[in-house]
């Protein structure tokens, strides 16, 4: 069987939701010593980067200028060390936003509720779309989808203090082309007095996966790490095939 290197990690720098006409940046984190990285879009070669010097950096950035609906979709990347190619990365969905119109987001029964109450968000957009998306700030990968002609419902069920936070919605013209974001709606959830200190909370840290973690290294340590990584991979493939 053909030997391959471990798959790289593909990430969007800052966010995978890119306003139209702005620049998107995708990072492909592979291995020290990789001489070539390829970015694939919808299964076809999209761009090539060759790091310099290859042994001192573990990945590359691909800049995609002037974002539009034709560049929105599924991206993946691969890399090469010598003549050996890696497996393909997982797929990354790159979305273009700020298309057409702005929806309105509202919450029922209201923006401040007691823990245990049932809450429903409503996203409304009068232009032609049937798919709506709800995102919580700091949790942009946890996209909820709902469908409706003009207005979609997002039932949250009985809420806890973990639901506290700021929410926005989008109308979606297809999976990768979204409207402008709604104005945010902040949901406050009050717990019972004795429960409040024990209630789970959901800190809205920035999306850690939307950070490029490329490192530039010097010295023998990384050369040894590369040798060890390659040796382990070599052993792994021979051991299992």
């Amino acid at each position: 069987p053909k030997q391959t290197l471990p798959k790289p990690i593909i990430r969007a720098e800052s966010t995978y939701m890119v306003p139209k006409e702005k620049q998107a940046t995708l990072c492909c984190q592979g291995s020290y010593g990789a001489v070539e990285y390829q970015l694939h879009f919808e299964g076809s070669l999209f761009a090539v980067e060759r790091p310099k010097p290859p042994e001192r950096i573990n990945g590359v950035k691909f800049h995609i200028p002037d974002m539009n609906s034709r560049k929105a979709g599924r991206y993946s990347c691969i890399y090469r060390v010598g003549e050996l190619w890696s497996e393909r990365s997982d797929l990354l969905d790159l979305v273009v936003t700020e298309m057409y119109d702005t929806p309105t987001l509202s919450v029922h029964p209201g923006p401040e509720v007691t823990s245990g109450e049932k809450v429903t968000f409503y996203c409304r957009l009068d232009t032609a779309t049937s798919m709506f998306l709800l995102l919580k700030e700091g949790r942009s990968r946890d996209v909820q989808r709902s469908y409706g002609k003009v207005q979609a419902e997002f039932p949250m069920g009985p809420v806890t203090t973990a639901h506290r936070g700021s929410y926005r919605c989008f109308g979606s013209y297809n999976n990768y082309a979204w409207s402008f974001p709604s104005e945010p709606v902040k949901l406050l959830v009050t717990g019972d007095i004795e429960n409040t200190s024990l209630a789970p909370t959901d800190p809205t840290f920035p999306d850690s996966w939307d950070t490029c973690l490329l490192t530039r290294e010097t010295g023998l340590q990384k050369d040894l790490a590369l040798w060890d990584h390659t040796a382990q991979n070599h052993h792994h493939h021979h051991h299992h095939h």
């Epitope: 509202s106 029922h108 029964p109 209201g110 923006p111 401040e112 509720v113 429903t120 406050l188």
Partner: nanobody, 122 residues
Framework: DVQLVESGGGSVEAGGSLRLSCAAS??????MGWFRQAPGKAREGVAC??????????DYADSVKGRFTITQDNAKNTVYLQMNSLKPEDTAMYYC???????????????WGQGTQVTVSS
């Protein structure tokens, strides 16, 4: 079921004031508001009020901000719309609504009153 009864409409000259009332019978309504519809125009939101566990929230259409004030008397289950500095373009049928989403959004379970006419002459 919820019954909504509006009152307080009438005719007034531009710059004048009116106070609309909406009494809700049945269970307590936490989000109530006012919508209006002028002849030949679409119904539009005017103002709404939501009473949360610790805080009361209000929302207004841009066209009435600074002129209209919405308040709620929870004991009477009644919502009021104080309308000052009225303009001819405020002329419309005003409808009370209960069980809205906040801010100022009609949902499938929203309940409506019969309406009260407001006429502002120049």
């Amino acid at each position: 079921d919820v019954q909504l009864v509006e009152s307080g409409g009438g005719s007034v000259e531009a710059g004048g004031s009116l106070r609309l009332s909406c009494a809700a019978s049945g269970y307590r309504q936490r989000t109530m508001g006012w919508f209006r519809q002028a002849p030949g125009k679409a119904r539009e939101g005017v103002a709404c009020i939501y009473t949360g566990p610790t805080t009361t929230f209000t929302d207004y259409a841009d066209s009435v901000k600074g002129r209209f004030t919405i308040t709620q008397d929870n004991a009477k289950n009644t919502v009021y719309l104080q309308m000052n500095s009225l303009k001819p373009e405020d002329t419309a049928m005003y409808y009370c609504a209960a069980n809205l989403a906040y801010p100022l959004t009609i949902i499938p379970d929203t309940r409506w009153g019969q309406g009260t006419q407001v006429t502002v002459s120049s």
